[in-house]
């Protein structure tokens, strides 16, 4: 059993490293932006220039094309749970220090927890998404 | 209140067979995934089992797989571990716990706990 | 012997502030939730900590739990004589699909 651990391990490991998950990281920020966009930005508030551009292309298509490519990505994560959890925990982890405050993080960890049932995959199961801005040791 | 009690606990041979009943009460048992944890004497606490919901899944501890059978009755409240081919590293206090593990994102953690009933297996 | 790794015991005088540390692998902590158990005397365990940090109701404050990567940690403050227990850490481990508890802490409150 050990040895399977280690060559578990080492397969999701260059699973990991292969893999690309920006455009999910992406799919992800357009996704609460547009939702800061419709639900919680004050009209009035001088916060924002509507005219700045945006670090993430807001417009649907865009996000739609980023979702398509990130759920490519988590299917190869599929038959092998452990290392989907590590996927979505690195996505977390990546973005974490670009999330303003805790309202946008709780939002961004929502929908991450749909990523998977977005892309038509299983969930991880008790997959611990708490992840510190410190981030995390790597086994 | 919540209350989970044990029941069948007994002296038995090596290579012999028990069933542990757990009648639960208090709460709607077939909304919990339900766990046995059991603790040899002077020792620390080993989980057994898991059992979901609705029973379609089952996890064991590896030196029990095949010799133990978890299983339940969600519409008289009951959880059930049958143990066969019973050995001396078997004996210990069994405990009946509610899980409180719902969805993916959360984890197992057994937040009520039956008074436990002992099995002892000895010739 | 366990996988999850505890000091085995543990004192401190009343009043003070103890942690107990919980460690593991990627596989179990670094990957899942970690719950804490108190055990008193010729008594069932009770539940303390689940999900890393939260505390069920009627559990005082005094008690907390963290975790970073691996290694999880359960913090009492205040100590009491009546916390004198065994505590266990537990947590699921992907790769054995099992639930794993740590060895135990005694607590001594001298």
């Known amino acids: 059993r050990q040895q399977w651990e280690l060559q578990g391990d080492r397969r999701c490991q260059s699973q990991l490293e292969r893999a690309n998950l920006r455009p999910c990281e992406q799919h992800l920020m357009q996704k609460i932006q547009r939702d800061e966009d419709s639900y919680g930005r004050d009209p009035y508030s001088p916060s924002q220039d509507p005219y700045s551009p945006s670090p993430y292309d807001r417009r649907g298509a865009g996000s739609s094309q980023h979702q398509e490519r990130c759920c490519n990505e988590l299917n190869e994560f599929e038959n092998n749970q452990r290392c989907m959890c590590e996927a979505l925990q690195q996505i977390m982890e990546n973005q974490s220090d670009r999330l303003q405050g805790r309202q946008q993080e709780q939002q961004f960890k929502r929908e991450l927890r749909n990523l998977p049932q977005q892309c038509g995959l299983r969930a991880p199961q008790r997959c611990d998404l708490e992840v510190e801005s410190g981030g995390r040791d790597r086994y | 209140e919540v209350q989970l009690v044990e029941s069948g606990g007994a002296l038995v041979q090596p290579g012999g067979s028990l069933r542990l009943s757990c009648a639960a009460s208090?709460?709607?048992?077939?909304?919990?995934?339900m766990t046995w944890i059991r603790q040899a004497p002077g020792k620390g606490l080993e989980w057994v089992a898991n059992i979901k919901q609705d029973g379609s899944e089952k996890d064991y501890l590896d030196s029990v797989r095949g010799r133990f059978n978890i299983s339940r009755d969600n519409a008289k409240s009951v959880l059930y571990l049958q143990m066969n081919t019973l050995s001396a590293d078997d004996t210990g206090v069994y405990y009946c716990?509610?899980?409180?593990?719902?969805?993916?994102?959360?984890?197992?953690?057994?937040?009520?706990w039956g008074q436990g009933i002992l099995v002892t297996v000895s010739s | 012997q366990s996988v999850l790794t505890q000091p085995p015991s543990i004192s401190a005088a009343p009043g003070q502030k103890v942690t107990i540390s919980c460690s593991g692998t990627g596989s179990n902590i670094g990957h899942n939730y970690v719950s804490w158990y108190q055990q008193l005397p010729r008594t069932a365990p009770r539940l303390l900590i689940f999900d890393n940090t939260k505390r069920p109701s009627g559990i005082p404050d005094r008690f907390s739990g963290s975790k970073s990567g691996s290694s999880a940690t359960l913090g009492i403050t205040g100590l009491q004589t009546g916390d004198e227990a065994h505590y266990f850490c537990a947590t699921w481990d992907a790769d054995l699909s099992a639930v794993l508890f740590g060895g135990g802490t005694k607590l001594t409150v001298l």
């Open positions: 208090g709460f709607k048992f077939s909304t919990f995934y």
């Open positions: 716990t509610r899980n409180g593990l719902q969805d993916s994102y959360s984890g197992d953690f057994f937040d009520h």
